[in-house]
């Protein structure tokens, strides 16, 4: 049975205290005192007898520029808004010293996500509210207390759609090289049902989880030279727009019927994925239309079956694989899920098993290339306009966002004469409004101490005379006398 308690717990984990490596001493695009998330960041994790160093880069391709959010307002009306301009905290990258490694994490409130090293998939999540430097659990998916989930797409339906499956067609590519074709893009619309909303408790929590999931799905597809870009999110915070049944095939039919009615007034997209908090019957956690990508039936339903978002991300990647014409690996004679991984570990395995998969098999890749030869797949060729930031700049929310020079809160609260609270621009004649090196609206002269030494290894920082913020905290390297 798919887990009826969706937030299962870990059976076995290691406690780690991530250590953020100091970045280069260069001016950042936004003031450091605002605590906004940097373009690149590295963390050292002491886990499983190793020190893993994760090098991460913000996923700037996570959202399309026309990204919309739809929800129900307090008065019961449906509202669609197009947030613009805020920063975000979803990263992708690799593990230093491991050539085929991958990492996909959010850093919004501690570190959460996965990193893959060789055949091991490590999951990480915060254990407390100590932020990125606090206690985190690092564990392997098999140590989540959950049972295996299966895909509801039947082998019979796959057979009739995909024809005979033999290994002859699947000539493995040398090494891990990407397909030589152009990058393809799936413009994704995600619908979150009321059960999932109730489980997570707020629109902000839903948005955070969906962005985390899509970030993971995108990372899984990058090895196929595919990008998954979120163009719309619909949250059923008040009530479901159609019946979400425990029978996944009924729910998929309802989703596709509803989508057909909505397409004219909803964001144009290549694929729709429902994330539900409903427990599907039996062991099924996902169901999809096979080879339906770019058609009106392009969609799938996914149960959020695991505490860790990597779980539903793997399910979504699998169901999207069916939309892209992929069969279950075990249906294909001679299908190779790279030999360094044991059988059943690839994304298109019929059962997700107790350990989350992290790659596509050779036959999945061949099915995909075959699907891309069809005229139907043309919708994947257009690169969407990519939004470079999530959410919109909100003047008055105490965060300096794109296009703002300062933000001291709503006009009735602002007591900072250096900042025009209605425009979030500097007041006339002001050089700065925030920061340790800003005094009386002017940047302090170079050489003024702005951060004293904390201990023997720390270095004191001084204002540089040009910027209102104190330079990033620096310290002597270990071993320096």
């Amino acid at each position: 049975i798919a887990p009826s308690r969706p937030w299962a717990l870990m059976e076995q984990y290691e406690v780690v205290l991530p250590w953020r490596l100091p970045g280069p001493r260069v001016r950042r695009a936004l003031p450091s005192h605002l605590g906004l998330h940097p373009e690149r960041v590295s963390y050292v994790l002491g886990a499983t007898g190793h020190n893993f160093t994760l090098h991460l880069r913000k996923n700037r391709d996570l959202l399309g520029s026309g990204y919309t959010e739809t929800y129900t307002a307090a008065n019961g009306s449906e509202v669609t808004e197009q947030p613009r301009g805020q920063d975000h905290c979803f990263y992708q990258g690799h593990v230093e010293g491991y050539p085929d490694s991958a990492a996909s994490l959010s850093t919004c409130a501690g570190l959460r996500g996965f990193f893959q090293v060789g055949s091991d998939l490590h999951l990480i999540e915060p254990l407390d509210e100590g932020g990125e430097g606090g206690r985190h659990a690092v564990y392997q998916a098999e140590h989540l207390l959950q049972t295996a989930g299966t895909c509801g797409v039947s082998d019979d339906s796959l057979g009739s759609l995909l024809g005979p499956r033999t290994a002859a067609v699947f000539r493995p590519r040398p090494g891990d090289s990407l397909p030589s074709r152009e990058t393809r893009y799936v413009e994704l619309y995600v619908v979150v049902d009321n059960a999932e909303f109730q489980m997570l408790g707020s629109e902000a929590a839903v948005r955070h989880r969906v962005l985390e999931v899509v970030n993971h799905v995108d990372k899984l597809y990058q090895k196929l030279n595919f990008r998954v870009v979120l163009v719309g999110l619909e949250i059923w915070n008040s009530q479901d727009r159609f019946h979400v049944s425990p029978d996944p095939s009924v729910t998929l039919e309802n989703l596709l019927t509803w989508q057909a009615r909505q397409r004219t007034r909803r964001h144009l997209h290549d694929n729709v994925q429902l994330i539900t908090g409903v427990d599907f019957t039996g062991t099924t956690v996902g169901f999809a239309r096979v080879s339906a990508m770019c058609s009106h039936s392009s969609g799938a339903v996914n149960q959020d079956h695991s505490k860790n978002p990597v779980g539903v991300a793997c399910t979504m990647a699998h169901e999207m694989g069916h939309n892209l014409g992929m069969d279950h690996d075990e249906n294909v004679q001679g299908c190779r899920c790279q030999e360094r991984f044991e059988a059943g570990r690839c994304i298109m395995a019929g059962s997700i098993g107790s350990s989350f998969p992290r790659m596509f098999s050779d036959c999945s890749q061949a099915y995909l290339e075959s699907f891309l030869e069809r005229p139907q797949s043309v919708c994947l060729a257009n690169a969407p306009d990519l939004s470079h930031l999530v959410g919109g700049p909100v003047c008055g929310n105490l965060f300096v966002e794109r296009g703002e020079q300062c933000d001291c809160g709503p006009p009735e609260d602002c007591r900072n004469r250096c900042c025009n609270s209605t425009t979030c621009q500097l007041a006339e004649g002001a050089q700065c409004a925030h920061g340790t090196c800003c005094q009386e609206c002017k940047v302090k002269p170079a050489g003024e101490l702005c951060r004293p030494k904390k201990d023997m290894c720390d270095l004191e920082e001084f204002c540089d005379g040009r910027h209102p913020e104190c330079p990033e905290d620096a310290f002597q390297e270990n071993g320096t006398p």
Epitope: G35, C108, G396
Partner: nanobody, 121 residues
Framework: EVQLVESGGGLVQAGGSLRLSCAAS????????MAWHRQAPGKQRELVAA???????NYPDSVKGRFTISRDNFKNTVYLQMNSLTPEDTAVYYC???????????????WGQGTQVTVSS
């Protein structure tokens, strides 16, 4: 109207820790930001920590690395974990909620009554 009730203040020795809580109730719509500010005697009120609807956080340099803001979406509650406290952290700490009733409508701001934090040397 929105009500904000702070708790957790008190007297603590230098180097100690405190955890402040602020529970919001009433007509809550779309919260943009929840924040903590403080005001020491004879000084201007200053921002201590803020958390945005997407969990982005903002701290001034004076508390970065010592204070952590977090929230519980289910309970509309915001917390401030304060570690390595110094006498300079002595002040009245105020909870602040910034929300809007509909997308792009004007921001509304609400304040709690404040809770006293005293750090003795």
């Amino acid at each position: 109207e929105v009500q904000l009730v702070e708790s957790g203040g008190g007297l603590v020795q230098a180097g100690g820790s405190l955890r402040l809580s602020c529970a919001a109730s009433g007509n809550i719509f779309r919260i943009e930001t929840m924040a903590w500010h403080r005001q020491a005697p004879g000084k201007q009120r200053e921002l201590v920590a803020a958390i945005r609807s997407d969990d982005m956080t903002n701290y001034p340099d004076s508390v970065k690395g010592r204070f952590t803001i977090s929230r519980d979406n289910f309970k509309n509650t915001v917390y401030l974990q304060m570690n390595s406290l110094t006498p300079e952290d002595t002040a009245v700490y105020y909870c602040n909620l910034i929300q809007r009733r509909a997308p792009y409508s004007r921001l509304e701001t609400y304040w709690g009554q404040g809770t006293q934090v005293t750090v003795s040397s």
